[in-house]
């Protein structure tokens, strides 16, 4: 069953005398490991003897016999996968067929590999792309069907015998599929490389020449041109003649068409290698070149700049930038077509010559309003002086100037008045379009720049306005100086610091927060009665009768303001105590009698004590003492004592008389 053995290796291997050969080889014998291996050189089967005739280069048998060739020929394989071989050195007479005779437990196999050994190192082979175009990167490949671990080689690229400076990438393959050494060189050929010789040189490890391959480069390129002009500097004056000639220095393939271009545009009916320009005008100034085409494409010559000279044309002024903002910088540029370029300039501002300005540009580092106006210029070259053009207008813009806030009212202004203010300015560019006011309020602006404040507040202190165009300019604030009656009038107790007790020294202060004008008068009043005209009201020794509701008034020339009523409270111990009796001081026994302890006290009496005629305190502590039923024994003098937080007071004695009832008298 021939499918049992599978071999993979290169079909033919190439080498030369004295080099070596490395034979990558794999196999698969499905029925077991390798038992013996013999390497034949040119094995031939002898039908008669049923044996293979040929040189045995290597033998590895069960009995381990190894021939002398073993040193030169090595089996580097194994018993089940690898059948790689090496012959080092390899000789010319090794050329031919190698037979790998292999034996497993159940089968024998002969695998044949061709070996081609040349007398001298064979040349590599250069592979070029089918077409090479200038400036297009190509890969040059140098391939040598040789690689051996024991014999290092190198491939070097030469252009016209000189090593190429581009880096080549060398790769080797020693696989069952292929054995080779390859060098790849990326290269962007120029038209000048056309026809040049490229060499791939095979060298040994020491750089010694072994063999080479050469190719001639066929670089397709557009025509390469040279342009010649008479006069050679290409500078003429109007009316002169000019001749230009186009020469082809190289073209691959041959050129097919010729044309001339001016400033990139093709000139009609100019299809020869010579261009004649007669009586040139300034419009014929420009960049000329010739264009010649082949199958690759068009090639252009270098440009010739033809200069037809003439005096300056009427000038124009360009302003960078208008309108200009005051304080910014401005540049004026005088533009005039001329050849050669103007060498001198004269500048005018509003028709008047600007002294010392002779350059193409005028630079003003800091623009002021007076710089506004019309700017014009005149250009001059060796052929003459140009005319002054229409000029350009410079507009200088600035914020409103000298802004003031003006009060229109007669002075002084009183709280509650209607106040009118106007916002004035001296000049502005562009015009003022709006106004702003500080502080902001719900105020009327009856017309642009006028502010009306209805019912002006006492605290409206200052007002400022701004006049605005593209910018806002603020005026200094103006003081309204609003006059008003005294504000926040109130009574304040200065002393004592604590509550007022009868007999204390007491001072009250009439306070106010502000007044305009500052000059004020004071008035004190109690229950509608005027008490004094000072800011303070003083009591040397306060009495309960001084208690009551006090107000103070403060007035100035604008008006007067009263404080809220302030209650003066005087604290004193119980006084004017007396015992009143109900229904009277004479009561019949058995009835009811009520004794009441009356007093005047602040704060009110909090505690009462009752005493009898023996100054014996009774077990009663309320304001009323009720005797029910009253007895004759209750007759006698009574008094009471009242106590509050300030102190105590006692009443005089009051006598209660209890008389017998008729029943009692009747029983007696």
């Amino acid at each position: 069953d021939s499918s049992k053995w599978v071999f993979e290796h290169p079909e033919t291997l190439y080498a030369w005398e004295g080099a070596c050969v490395w034979i990558p080889c794999t196999y698969r014998a499905l029925d077991g490991d390798l038992e013996s291996f013999i390497l034949f050189h040119n094995p031939e089967y002898n039908k008669n003897t049923s044996k293979f005739d040929g040189t045995r280069l290597y033998e590895s048998t069960k009995d381990g016999k190894v021939p002398s060739e073993q040193k030169r020929v090595q089996f580097l394989g194994d018993k089940n996968k690898n059948c790689t071989l090496s012959i080092h050195p390899v000789h010319l007479n090794d050329s031919g067929q190698l037979g790998l005779r292999m034996e497993s437990k159940t089968e024998k196999w002969m695998e044949r590999i061709h070996l081609n050994v040349s007398e001298r190192p064979f040349p590599p082979h250069i592979q070029l792309p089918p077409e090479i175009q200038e400036s297009q990167e190509v890969t040059l490949t140098c391939l040598l069907n040789f690689s051996c671990y024991g014999y290092p080689i190198q491939l070097q690229w030469l252009l016209e015998g000189v090593p190429m400076r581009q880096a080549a990438v060398t790769s080797t393959s020693l696989t069952i599929k292929s054995v080779f050494t390859r060098s790849e060189l990326k290269f962007s050929p120029q038209w000048s490389h056309h026809g040049k010789i490229v060499t791939c040189q095979l060298q040994d490890a020491d750089g010694k020449f072994l063999s080479n391959d050469t190719v001639q480069l066929n670089v397709k390129h557009t025509p390469k041109l040279e342009i010649k002009v008479t006069p050679s500097d290409a500078i003429v004056r109007e009316g002169d003649s000019v001749t230009m000639t186009c020469e082809v220095s190289s073209s691959n393939p041959e050129y097919t068409t010729v044309s001339w271009l001016k400033d990139g545009t093709s000139l009609k009916k100019q299809n020869t290698f010579t261009l004649n320009l007669r009586e040139v005008t300034k419009d014929q100034s420009g960049k000329y070149c010739c264009q010649v085409s082949n199958d690759v494409g068009p090639g252009r010559s270098e440009e010739v700049f033809l200069q037809v000279q003439y005096a300056p044309e009427p000038s124009t002024v360009q302003i960078l930038h208008s309108p200009a903002v005051e304080g910014s910088q401005v540049e004026f540029l005088c533009m005039s077509l001329a050849n050669p370029l103007p060498t001198n300039y004269t500048w005018y501002h509003n028709g008047k010559e600007m002294q010392g300005r002779t350059e193409e540009k005028v630079h003003i580092p800091k623009i002021l309003p007076w710089h506004a106006g019309t700017y014009s210029c005149v250009a001059e070259n060796i052929l003459g002086t140009g005319q002054r053009g229409p000029g350009a207008e410079l507009d200088v813009q600035y914020p409103p100037k000298k802004v003031t806030t003006v009060i229109q009212n007669p002075m002084p202004i009183r709280e509650g008045d209607t106040v009118t203010l106007s916002c004035n300015y001296n000049s502005s560019n562009p015009s003022v379009t709006r106004y702003e006011w500080k502080p902001h309020g719900a105020w009327e602006e009856p017309s642009l720049g006028v502010l009306k404040i209805q019912n002006v507040g006492w605290d409206n202190t200052t007002i400022a306005c701004a006049a605005c165009n593209s910018w806002c300019s603020w005026a200094s604030p103006v003081a309204l100086n609003v006059q008003y009656a005294p504000r926040d009038v109130r009574v304040r107790k200065i002393k004592p610091l604590s509550e007022i007790h009868s007999g204390n020294s007491v001072s009250l202060q009439c306070d106010f927060s502000s007044s305009h004008p500052k000059e004020v008068q004071f008035f004190w009043e109690k229950n509608g009665r005027l008490l004094g005209k000072e800011s303070q009201l003083n009591f040397d020794s306060i009495s309960p009768e001084d208690a009551g509701s006090y107000s103070c008034w403060v007035n100035n020339s604008i008006g007067q303001t009263a404080s809220k009523a302030w209650t003066l409270e005087v604290l004193y111990a119980p006084r004017r105590l007396r015992v009143s009796m109900s229904p009277g001081d004479q009561v019949m026994e058995g009835k009811s009698a009520t004794l009441t302890c009356e007093s005047d006290a602040n704060p009110p009496v909090s505690h009462y004590t009752w005493f009898d005629w023996n100054n014996q305190s009774l077990p009663y502590h309320s304001q009323k003492l009720r005797l029910e039923p009253v007895k004759v024994q209750h007759s006698g003098a009574y008094w009471c004592q009242g106590t509050n937080s300030v102190g105590k007071g006692r009443s005089p004695l009051s006598t209660l008389t209890v008389y017998y009832s008729p029943e009692t008298i009747g029983r007696r």
């Epitope: 021939s2 089967y45 049923s50 159940t106 089968e107 196999w109 002969m110």
Partner: nanobody, 128 residues
Framework: QVQLVESGGGLVQPGDSLRLSCTVS????????MGWFRQAPGKEREAVSC????????YYADSVRGRFTISRDNAKNTVYLEMNSLKPEDTAIYYC?????????????????????WGQGTQVTVSS
């Protein structure tokens, strides 16, 4: 250890027939190539006829083709050589050989190649 035992040789007259048989023992593989070889005095050994066990393909040397027939009995591990119209030049010692199948690339050889296992031989003499 492979053993081959040949039998059937002898002295015959030209034009007679002989049948040689060879029995194999100790050969492990089911697949093999078996053949008859002869060596006349002073001459090199040559293949006479071979047979492949796997497919029964036969080989005959040009000098015996049409006169000799090779056959096998796989069950008995025996190969036979039927020799008719014997000639004096057929005189030789006839050896039986067996070996593993030999493949050269994809080609399978019918005869044993470089074989190791030999019989002791049987003498065939054709003489009038």
């Amino acid at each position: 250890q492979v053993q081959l035992v040949e039998s059937g040789g002898g002295l015959v007259q030209p034009g007679d027939s002989l049948r040689l048989s060879c029995t194999v023992s100790g050969f492990t593989s089911d697949y093999y190539a078996m053949g008859w070889f002869r060596q006349a005095p002073g001459k090199e050994r040559e293949a006479v006829s071979c047979i492949s066990s796997s497919d029964g393909v036969t080989y005959y040397a040009d000098s015996v083709r049409g006169r000799f027939t090779i056959s096998r009995d796989n069950a008995k591990n025996t190969v036979y050589l039927e020799m008719n119209s014997l000639k004096p030049e057929d005189t030789a010692i006839y050896y039986c050989a067996v070996d593993k199948p030999f493949y050269d690339g994809g080609y399978l050889y019918t005869c044993p190649v470089d074989f190791d296992s030999w019989g002791q031989g049987t003498q065939v003499t054709v003489s009038s």
